[in-house]
Every structure is written in structure tokens, then in C-alpha cells.
């Protein structure tokens, strides 16, 4: 392969290592949880916001909203941070695809239903467009063995 391709590979690899894709994972998972509760089955009891991850309100992780945020507020915060991260891949479509594949791989084991998996893939494919970025033309998001988890 040509030298510039190898350089491109290395550049993509270092971009992926630098990127923090957690906000993307959090945004997407909250979105499909929210959709599941709205349309997929009987809604869960609405006494607290069921759409943001549960946790200690004193946590300092800037990517995790308090469970007491208004419905969906945490998710839009994640989306904004996610778009900032994906913006780094704007000029490299192949690398953008690898970032999306990494997100899919990290979350695939969390998705134990066909519908949930398909919806996650749909939302993931739409993510660059939602961020006002160009989506990769061809990007295979299939995960063969159910994925490798990052805890």
C-alpha cells in the first residue's frame, strides 16, 4: 500500500485514541431507552426521570447528567459533546466510520434484542448528520460475536 495510506491509518488510529466517544454512547443509549419507554412497551413509572443514567448526584463526571435533570436534558448535553468529538473526524470519512464502529462495538453487548440493536444502528448512522457533519458513504456496523465490552 502507498505511504500516504499508511500515514492516514496511523493518523486515524491516534485520532481514535484521543477521542472520547463516551458522550456519543450515552446520548444514543438514552435515546433508545427513551424511545423504548415511549413506544416499545408499557411506559415505566414516571416518578423520576427514567431517561438519564442513575447515579450519585455528587458525581463529578461531566458526561453524566444528574438523574434529576429535566427529561432528555442530559441526552442533549451528551449530544453536543458527542458532536464536538465527531467533528474531529469530519475530514476523514474512513476514520469517522471507524469511530462509529467503535461505538457499536462498545455497546453491542448492552443490546440484547434485535429491535434494540437495529434501532441503535439506525441512530448511530444518523449521528453525523444530526451533528451537521457528512456521514460516511459505506460503513459496516455489523458486530460478529456480540461485541467486546468496555466497562
Amino acid at each position: 500500500r502507498q505511504q500516504w495510506e499508511l500515514q492516514g491509518d496511523r493518523r486515524c488510529q491516534s485520532q481514535l485514541e484521543r477521542a472520547n466517544l463516551r458522550p456519543c454512547e450515552q446520548h444514543l443509549m438514552q435515546k433508545i431507552q427513551r424511545d423504548e419507554d415511549s413506544y416499545g412497551r408499557d411506559p415505566y413509572s414516571p416518578s423520576q426521570d427514567p431517561y438519564s443514567p442513575s447515579q450519585d448526584p455528587d458525581r463529578r463526571d461531566p458526561y453524566s447528567p444528574s438523574p434529576y435533570d429535566r427529561r432528555g436534558a442530559g441526552s442533549s448535553q451528551h449530544q453536543e459533546r458527542c458532536c464536538n468529538e465527531l467533528n474531529e473526524f469530519e475530514n476523514n470519512q474512513r476514520c469517522m466510520c471507524e469511530a462509529l464502529q467503535q461505538i457499536m462495538e462498545n455497546q453491542s453487548d448492552r443490546l440484547q434484542g434485535r429491535q434494540q440493536e437495529q434501532q441503535f444502528k439506525r441512530e448511530l448512522r444518523n449521528l453525523p448528520q444530526q451533528c451537521g457533519l457528512r456521514a460516511p458513504q459505506r460503513c459496516d456496523l455489523e458486530v460478529e460475536s456480540g461485541g467486546r465490552d468496555r466497562y
Epitope: 463516551r22 443514567p53 447515579q55 440484547q112 434484542g113
Partner: antibody, heavy 118, light 111 residues
Amino acid sequence: EVQLVESGGGVVQPGRSLTLTCVGSGFNFDDYTMHWVRQRPGKGLEWVSSIRYNSVRIEYVESVKGRFTTSRDNAKNSLYMEMKSLRPEDTAFYYCVKDNGFRSFEIWGQGTMVIVSS
Amino acid sequence: EIVMTQSPLSLPVTPGEPASISCRSTQSLEHSNGYHYLDWYVQKAGQSPQLLISLGSKRASGVPDRFSGSVSGTDFTLKISRVEAEDVGVYYCMQALQTWTFGQGTKVEIK
């Protein structure tokens, strides 16, 4: 109504085999991961095995690896667990369980009893 | 393997009074997606277990709002705001981060 019905339990001698069957109804069986969970007499719950909706990933608790084999036939809405080289400590109530799509055990069958004794 | 430890193992309760059960994991149950993979189940006498709370604090369909779940690091709590006679049974926490493992169970009975 979503329902899971287990069958195949019974009394078996140590070292012998048994196959449990679970039939699902009231939901799209081929859309969900399914699990087997067991409960020894008077004891707590123990996850035993899971199989993804498309069978690409099958997992087992360490104590049954190499002895138990989980499979499914989506055309028959059926889940199976073949249990070989059974031991007295495998004596338990075995429940078939439907995943909710996010790793939670949403629907449980009524269970089937397996007794391993000479 | 993640080990789940519940306390107390036995909980005598008075109807109308609050009750809480604790569960501790040997490691964080928070996934990179921000969710805590901790569920609560109840098994009533002679019945199969049923899901009460998923992902730390999300009440399952049909579960009364007197049940709530909370998370603080590796400590998880199931609270019943006002115990009713029908709440007696064995309560289990379960982690779903890496495969699945249950706590030993807490037997809730009327005083």
C-alpha cells in the same frame, strides 16, 4: 399474554444427561436474548446460561462450561439446554427467562425441577 | 467475577413503615454508556421471581411507585416507602455488567 413454559425436568442419576425445553408465546421470540437461571433447593438464584436472539453468542456460568449446551430454534419459539455429566449440585429449579433487550430479566417461566440423585 | 453482597439477609418489617435493602458490588457497575447495570427482583412464596427495578433506578412496568432504587458508587439501595403485606418475599439484586450474578437475597417478612 407473554408466557414461557419449561419442560423436561425430572430425576436423573449422576453422570447422565437431560434436556430442558422452554416454549415462548405472546412475543416475538426471535427478537430477544433468552436465559436459563437456576435455584437450588432453599437457596438463591444463579444465572446459568444465555443465548443471543440470533445464536451468535452463547455464554455459561463457569461451573457448567463444557457440560451444558444452550441452543434455540426460533421457528419453533423454543429454547433448549442439554445438560450432560450431571452432578448432585446441579439439582435445582431451572427457570427460562426472557431478556428485556437491555440485559434485564423481564419475564420468567414457572420453572422445571431437576433432581440429580443415585 | 463480580460478587454482589446484600444486607441485611433478613428484614422484619411493619406495614406502613419504610424499609430498605442494600447491595454492594466488588467493582463499579457503570458502563461507558453511563448506565449502572444493577437490577432488583422479588420472589414471593411459591412464585417465580419478577423484575422490580432495572438499570439501578428504572421501575419496571406495573411496579408500584412505593418501590425505588438508587445508586452511589458501588452501593445500591432498594427502598420501599410504605411496606404493604403483599411485599413479603425474598429480594435479590443482580449485576448485569459482566454476564450476570445475583446477591444472596434478603428475606422480607412482617414483624
